[in-house]
């Protein structure tokens, strides 16, 4: 679809005569008839296939024709067509004399024709005007013409329909050849596909408008390139959605079981060495001068009874000092000036001479120790209790007081986590290296099966005859609300027809 435009510019009829040679009285009041038709090698009679147009009287004899397009006037003349422009045409322009105001052919005098021109040729669609001038014996007509496409039509033949749009069906403007040119942020054949935020993950993200990045289930982040770990995952990460891959030192389904209590909590004080000994359990090896489960208690250096042979210990700022009894000397009163003759062994210890009587050694009875058997044995000094157990002296023996989760003489045994039946609602308990796991019966969830999740007893559509099904959340059973005319626990029996029982 397009328009052939003809711009009449100047008509010269100096003598003011008709084609017959007769002069116009008083002058030739000139109007034009235009016929546009398909190309003919010889312009032939017949329909103006591309259209016709007439002008009003434009002037007398010789005149210039004003460009009247801006005011909605008739110059240039418009000859619209609604087919593909063929690229060739025949154009006939007639100048007529109108003595009166009636311009109909039948109202004109028999010889009202002033001049007639016919041209044929090729004409491409375009904005540029072609200027032409046709001269006859007595007249001259100067005009220009062009073919342009109608609104929304494009291409060499005005045959490509393209209407710019910015809606659900497309977001584009039209190029001169009729091809679509997508508006910024849109792509695809009809510019219906938004261009997502730069970097938005191709699979995990999408968008409904440009520069947007909406995440698919299981993904998060500005570019939807971060997976969402399993709900409840505490100390873990994921590489695909809903995973919970535990960080170092953590275990369990939700990575909430601490396998590295030492690192995560640093329970040992005063520079003690911490050793992990199971889930949430540890042992502190204290530096000299400290005691307690976490080595939190500072020992007086004299508490370890470093002075032997009855020496008395004095605490000093930078250590301790032993005051030796007569007959002894040395840092810990360990050297004796005594011999067996001096009966140096206490508590029933027996004395043995050494080095030709220059020295001696005491052999102590059970429960006593020291170079002179002066010390009662402390069975807790070797820290025999494992897993942070507390050692207690009980007369001639010792015992370990264990921390929760441990048992055995030396707290060396790990109490089964399942022993205390931690799984609620009949859940099955599984002992794991790093803790326990509960397998819940239908209708329950949570780490300890403590959360009731309703079973949709109606999911299997147990009710007949369009009855409404309700789930009883307290018992996880269903109740059928029967429509009029039906009874039975599943509304399976019509009223009035007793059920046929098999007995």
């Amino acid at each position: 679809s397009g328009v052939f435009q003809l711009q009449l510019q100047e008509f010269i009829n100096e003598r003011g005569v008709l084609a017959s040679g007769r002069p116009c009285e008083p002058g030739c009041r000139t109007f034009f008839r235009v016929c546009l038709k398909h190309f003919q090698a010889v312009v032939s009679p017949g329909p103006c296939t591309f259209g016709t147009v007439s002008t009003p009287v434009l002037g007398t004899n010789s005149f210039a024709v004003r460009d009247d397009s801006s005011g909605g006037g008739r110059n240039p003349l418009q000859l619209p067509f609604n087919f593909t422009w063929p690229g060739t045409f025949s154009l006939i322009i007639e100048a007529w004399h109108a003595p009166g105001d009636d311009l109909r052919p039948e109202a004109l005098p028999p010889d009202a024709l002033i001049s007639k021109i016919a041209i044929q040729g090729s004409l491409a669609v375009g904005q540029n005007w072609l200027l032409d001038e046709q001269t006859s014996t007595l007249t001259r007509l100067r005009y220009s013409y062009r073919v342009i496409c109608s609104d929304n039509y494009y291409g060499d033949n005005c045959s490509r329909l393209c209407k710019k749009r910015n809606d659900h069906f497309g977001h584009y403007v039209c190029q001169p050849d009729g091809n679509l040119s997508c508006l910024p942020g849109w792509t695809g054949e009809y510019c219906q596909q938004p261009i997502c935020l730069s970097g938005c993950h191709e699979q995990n993200g999408y968008c409904s408008k440009p520069a947007e990045c909406l995440c698919r289930p299981g993904w998060q982040g500005r570019l939807c390139n971060e997976c969402i770990p399993h709900n409840g995952c505490r100390h873990g990460t994921c590489s695909t959605p809903w995973q919970c891959t535990c960080d170092e030192g953590w275990g369990g389904l939700f990575c909430d079981q601490d396998l590295n209590y030492c690192t995560h909590h640093s329970p040992c004080k005063n520079g003690a060495t911490c050793s992990n000994s199971g889930q949430r359990s540890y042992t502190c090896t204290c530096r000299p001068g400290y005691t307690g489960v976490d080595c939190e208690l500072e020992l007086s250096e004299c508490d370890s009874n470093p002075c032997r042979n009855g020496g008395s210990c004095k605490d000093q700022e930078d250590g301790y000092h032993c005051l030796c009894p007569p007959g002894y000397y040395g840092l810990h009163c360990e050297h004796s000036t005594l011999s067996c003759a001096d009966s140096p062994c206490f508590n029933g210890g027996s004395c043995r001479e050494r080095n030709q009587g220059a020295n001696y050694a005491c052999e102590c009875p059970p429960n006593f120790t020291g170079s002179n058997c002066e010390k009662k044995v402390d069975r807790c000094t070797s820290n025999p209790c494992a897993n942070g157990g507390q050692c207690l002296n009980r007369g001639p023996s010792r015992m370990c007081r264990c921390r929760p989760g441990f048992t055995g003489t030396y707290c060396e045994l790990h109490v089964s986590d399942c022993a205390r039946n931690p799984c609620a609602h009949g859940g099955t308990c599984h002992d794991l290296e790093n803790g326990l796991m509960c397998t819940c019966p239908a209708g329950f969830s949570g780490r300890r099966c403590e959360v009731r999740t309703s079973i949709d007893a109606c999911a299997s559509s147990p009710c007949f005859n369009r009855a409404t099904c309700y789930t009883d959340l307290s018992t996880d059973t269903f109740v059928c609300n029967c429509p009029y005319g039906f009874v039975g626990s599943r509304c399976e029996f019509p009223v009035g027809l007793p059920p046929s029982f098999p007995w």
């Epitope: 017959s20 016929c35 398909h38 312009v43 009679p45 028999p110 024709l113």
Partner: antibody, heavy 119, light 111 residues
């Protein structure tokens, strides 16, 4: 009113020529075309061709080309058809008719000229 | 050349009755949405008279009982109510291509 008046009947010998006139009145002769149509006795219509009165462009039916010539005199508003090398099958009534670029068709016809070719 | 075939060759119709004449072209006579088809009436001893142009447009002074229809290759002239003065030979003619050609004619008579 529009009128097309043709010249009178002609009797010609085979091999001769004949020139028929068609004088127009009541309209702007120059703006129109003149067609020529043949009708043999008891037969149908046969188009010979046309001439444009404003630029003298012609279009002939190949069947008659070489034997027929159209001319026009705008000063007298008269069109002419000359047929040469006459044969007996040229015996017919010859009509002139006007036509225009705005497709009404051959809306006005002359009364016809009978040409008899006989030895 | 485009061959125009008319049917029937002759037609006898009672006064006041409908008369229908067909014309078929050997190829389409349409161009740019216009049918280059005309119908003429010729009474004995008279020149032809234009009835219809462009397949369906009435010529000047033609009675309304004459109408034309069709496109492409098939065309029809209808006289809705035959009158005595309608006795004549009717011709179709194409002007799409040179040479312009006429149909063989259909003779319409009173039954």
């Amino acid at each position: 009113q529009v009128q097309l008046v043709q010249s009178g009947a002609e009797v010609k010998k085979p091999g001769a020529s004949v020139k028929i006139s068609c004088k127009a009145s009541g309209y702007s002769f120059t703006a129109y075309y003149i067609h020529w149509v043949k009708q043999a006795p008891g037969q149908g219509l046969e188009w010979i061709g046309y001439i444009s009165n404003y630029n003298r462009a012609t279009n002939y039916n190949q069947k008659f080309k070489g034997r027929v010539t159209f001319t026009t005199d705008t000063s007298t508003s008269t069109a002419y058809m000359e047929l040469r090398s006459l044969r007996s099958d040229d015996t017919a009534v010859y009509y002139c008719a006007r036509d225009y670029d705005y497709d009404v068709g051959m809306d006005y016809w002359g009364q016809g000229t009978l040409v008899t070719v006989s030895s | 050349d485009i061959v125009m075939t008319q049917s029937p060759d002759s037609l006898a119709v009672s006064l006041g009755e409908r008369a229908t004449i067909s014309c078929r072209a050997s190829e389409s006579v349409d161009n740019y949405g216009i049918s280059f088809m005309k119908w003429f009436q010729q009474k004995p001893g008279q020149p032809p008279k234009l009835l219809i142009y462009a397949a369906s447009n009435q010529g000047s002074g033609v009675p309304d009982r004459f109408s034309g229809s069709g496109s492409g290759t098939d065309f029809t002239l209808t006289i809705s109510s035959l009158q005595a003065e309608d006795v004549a030979v009717y011709y179709c003619q194409q002007s799409k291509e040179v040479p312009w050609t006429f149909g063989g004619g259909t003779k319409v008579e009173i039954k």
